[in-house]
């Protein structure tokens, strides 16, 4: 299958029962920092406020975060990350009522609780160290 | 759709102080920054106060308000207030309120208050 361009940018509408369903493979060994950065925007282009990031650093941990006035407000972090060297994942992003819950290749690692509410977000962009097979949405 | 009122402009001496208050309703926003920006005439608007909703509410300020303006915000009231001090002729503007989600661009500003420092 061919990969997509990265950085990837998909414009979507986000609501709870929604999913952003992502599939690719780490093109560097975890030995060098891989990383892998998912962002919700909330306007089609760079500038605007990111209501979630999700920012893996392969091997090691995932920082979150999001924008606010332009603001990096608090950052959250887990070391939980079954991610696999050199191996296929599968990210999903699933839009609840009260949180994003964020699942690799079905196993839950994190529960980002929402400030700027799904429904702002306009764009979601995929970008970084990764061979990028597929970006969906789900609603 | 977000509902934004600004409220509590008004003349003013310079070194007197004044209190805004912005009242939000008609959204799911409570989880979102809010703020305020001001535009003077013939200027753009430019960011003022925001401040978070994490545990800690963390304040942010523009250089130029700074140890001058204290920002809060009471989420039993979907309330945000901007307690202005020791005003100047400069910060003579409009102020809007905001929540986060929709800057830089001006898709929920909530009505302003006009704010007049002169002697």
């Known amino acids: 299958m061919s990969s997509l361009p990265v950085p990837y940018k998909l414009p979507v509408s986000l609501s709870v029962g929604s999913c952003v369903i992502i599939k690719g493979t780490p093109i560097h060994s975890f030995i060098n920092d891989p990383q892998l950065q998912v962002d919700f925007y909330t306007d089609m282009d760079e500038d605007s406020d990111i209501a979630f990031r999700f920012r893996v650093h392969f091997g090691n941990h995932v920082v979150m975060n999001r924008r606010e006035f332009g603001i990096w407000m608090l950052e959250e972090t887990t070391d939980y990350v079954p991610f696999e060297d050199g191996k296929q994942f599968e990210l999903c992003i699933y839009v609840h009522y009260n949180e994003y819950e964020i699942k690799v290749n079905g196993i839950r690692i994190y529960g980002f609780v929402h400030r700027i509410p799904p429904s702002f977000v306009k764009m979601v962009q995929v970008s970084r160290d990764i061979s990028l097979t597929s970006v969906c949405v789900c609603n | 759709e977000v509902q934004l009122q600004a409220s509590g402009g008004g003349f003013v001496q310079p070194g007197g102080s004044l209190r805004l208050s912005c009242a939000a309703s008609?959204?799911?926003?409570?989880?979102?920054?809010m703020g305020w920006f001001r535009q003077a005439p013939g200027k753009e608007r430019e960011f003022v106060s925001a401040i978070s909703s994490d545990p800690d509410t963390k304040a942010y300020y523009a250089d130029s308000v700074k140890g001058r303006f204290t920002i809060s915000r009471d989420n039993s009231k979907n309330t945000v207030y901007l307690q202005m001090n020791s005003l100047r002729a400069e910060d003579t503007a409009t102020y809007y309120c905001?929540?986060?989600?929709?800057?830089?661009?001006?898709?929920?500003w909530g009505h302003g208050t006009q704010v007049t420092v002169s002697s």
């Open positions: 008609g959204s799911s926003y409570a989880g979102s920054a």
């Open positions: 905001a929540i986060s989600g929709q800057y830089p661009y001006a898709r929920y």
